[in-house]
Amino acid sequence: IWELKKDVYVVELDWYPDAPGEMVVLTCDTPEEDGITWTLDQSSEVLGSGKTLTIQVKEFGDAGQYTCHKGGEVLSHSLLLLHKKEDGIWSTDILKDQKEPKNKTFLRCEAKNYSGRFTCWWLTTISTDLTFSVKSSRGSSDPQGVTCGAATLSAERVRGDNKEYEYSVECQEDSACPAAEESLPIEVMVDAVHKLKYENYTSSFFIRDIIKPDPPKNLQLKPLKNSRQVEVSWEYPDTWSTPHSYFSLTFCVQVQGKSKREKKDRVFTDKTSATVICRKNASISVRAQDRYYSSSWSEWASVPCS
Amino acid sequence: RNLPVATPDPGMFPCLHHSQNLLRAVSNMLQKARQTLEFYPCTSEEIDHEDITKDKTSTVEACLPLELTKNESCLNSRETSFITNGSCLASRKTSFMMALCLSSIYEDLKMYQVEFKTMNAKLLMDPKRQIFLDQNMLAVIDELMQALNFNSETVPQKSSLEEPDFYKTKIKLCILLHAFRIRAVTIDRVMSYLNAS
């Protein structure tokens, strides 16, 4: 058993039918010695008396808010949560496996640049009685500071019969140098509590591996005289690291017809302009990627050919 | 990156071309190692990230763009010197690059070259003959060193009398390649910045 926060405790259980569970001793936080009784949650049934209460915690019915009283007055509370270990593996009931980039990905994180700021998000089908708290650091043995905000509900989607809820959090490394070569990964730890169930999820990554630039901005077309060709130009996104000659991007320019089946023409360039043939009803899209370290491509920025 | 790219003309700044070749070569070599050594811990998540140049060179700090010198987090161990040198900068006026930066890059390349050659000698003794270093990568390191044109004492190739542990050697190869790729990215960024200066 360990303390998650004041008066909230997590009991780790080897989870299988007929498991013996864990013996837990609760102590009433009071100078009083006599006339103390214990109850669980809203029930008035007295579970025991005395300054300490010994319980055998086996299932969720044994978890909850234990309260010690004296003469109708509440003295203190202890909330017991359960953390299930199923055949050596901690349960992952609360969050959905996003399966991207690989199976067992519960937390996904992205950074728009090398400033040390990143966003993580996760999915759940649970709508109520749910709380998250997020911690992060650079490295684990001698951790360096990363400050995270509060996790917030960022999106709701309908997936088949189910509603899916997306939560996200923003974090910032306390002292980040954009040019630094990372040797210790960022660690992100999310504590999730649903009703009386506790779970924790972790992700470990280098900022360089989670870079996804914003799409190029100011995408413009300039028709070339007496030609079906146009000059496409764009700019680096505002959120990208500077100077741009050091943090360079490479670009992919795509000409896409109205029909998804039509052949796509693609050009790759390090410049911020390109000459392409603009077909009728087609659109031109441009996306960006770090020129030297192949992490994710940005989303497309698009303009119609007409 | 295995994609057709319209590359800029590197004419004015010869080192840019060499550094791009270097990054391409080390990335290809790392990809090959990860595929060939699939039953070894060779992915970024599995290896220990060691930097053989740590405390010996200061490339990141010495080659910091001027714009980032205002960022205190980048100035932890910055040694500044604005004297330019080396043939890559042939008659180019710049306040960004300093002798320390170029010589630091040169020293990095020299250290990795020695490590890779020593390692290749061991890998050639492996009866499994599973993986060897790409000669192209070694050649590209050499070309960039020549373009940098710094004179420094040659480091003797390490020779080891004891029987090599091939498992450990292959894991060390993965560690070296990951670290060298990261350094090659930094070198490319520096050369690109210099080219634009």
Epitope: D14, Y16, A19, G88 | -
Partner: antibody, heavy 115, light 112 residues
């Protein structure tokens, strides 16, 4: 104590369907994940499917994906395996099993797919 | 397709020490715990070892398990006639959990 009693096995023609049941008692069935495992005659153990305690997630072996469906009725304390488009290679003894470090197995039920 | 490899058969005379190996990889045995089952003809498998080396109550102490790196092994010290059975190791893969990975199985024969 924990008991898993299986039923529903038998002889069936290729292409036909069959539903296996596994009745649980002696524990809070709705709090534990459950597996189906099979064993072809003279062969080793092969995992077939898993269902979470609340039925929210189901996982299948590639060999049965799209043909077999694992389900549970927590109000009846029963686990099911619906098997469709049966093939000769599905012939095996099928076992239900609790998920956990200490597991409990059903007695097994024989499924024979033969024309 | 089995990714945990066991020898097809091992044998020993009563009182001898018999060991069965179970070889896997970094993403299964290398990352997860191992169980061992005994299966007598016509019966359901019986749990012998969980969490690599733990014995459930009721399992004789002549059975012991161990794990090192990407391999595990089951030892029967002082093998007895009633130990003649099929033995299976089981683990998980970190990417396909909760799918059970079973070993290929080993037939233990007690001679004489």
């Amino acid at each position: 104590q924990v008991q898993l009693v299986q039923s529903g096995g038998g002889v069936v023609q290729p292409g036909r369907s069959l539903r296996l049941s596994c009745a649980a008692s002696g524990f809070t069935f709705s709090e534990y994940g459950m597996h189906w495992v099979r064993q072809a005659p003279g062969k080793g153990l092969e995992w077939v499917a898993f269902i979470r305690y609340d039925g929210s997630n189901k996982y299948y072996a590639d060999s049965v994906k799209g043909r077999f469906t694992i389900s549970r009725d927590n109000s009846k304390n029963t686990l099911y395996l619906q098997m469709k488009s049966l093939r000769a290679e599905d012939t095996a003894v099928y076992y239900c099993k609790t998920h956990g470090s200490h597991d409990n197995w059903g007695q097994g039920t024989m499924v024979t797919v033969s024309s | 397709s089995y990714v945990l490899t066991q020898p097809p058969s091992v044998s020993g005379t009563p009182g001898q020490r018999v060991t069965i190996s179970c070889s896997g990889g970094r993403s299964n045995i290398g990352s997860n715990t191992v169980k061992w089952y005994q299966q007598l003809p016509g019966t359901a498998p019986k749990l012998l070892i969980y969490y690599n080396d733990q014995r459930p109550s009721g399992v004789p102490d002549r059975f012991s398990g161990s794990k090192s790196g990407t391999s595990a092994s089951l030892a029967i010290t002082g093998v007895q006639a009633e130990d003649e059975a099929d033995y299976y190791c089981q683990s998980y893969d970190r990417y396909t959990h909760p799918a059970l990975l079973f070993g290929t199985g080993t037939k233990v024969t007690v001679l004489g």
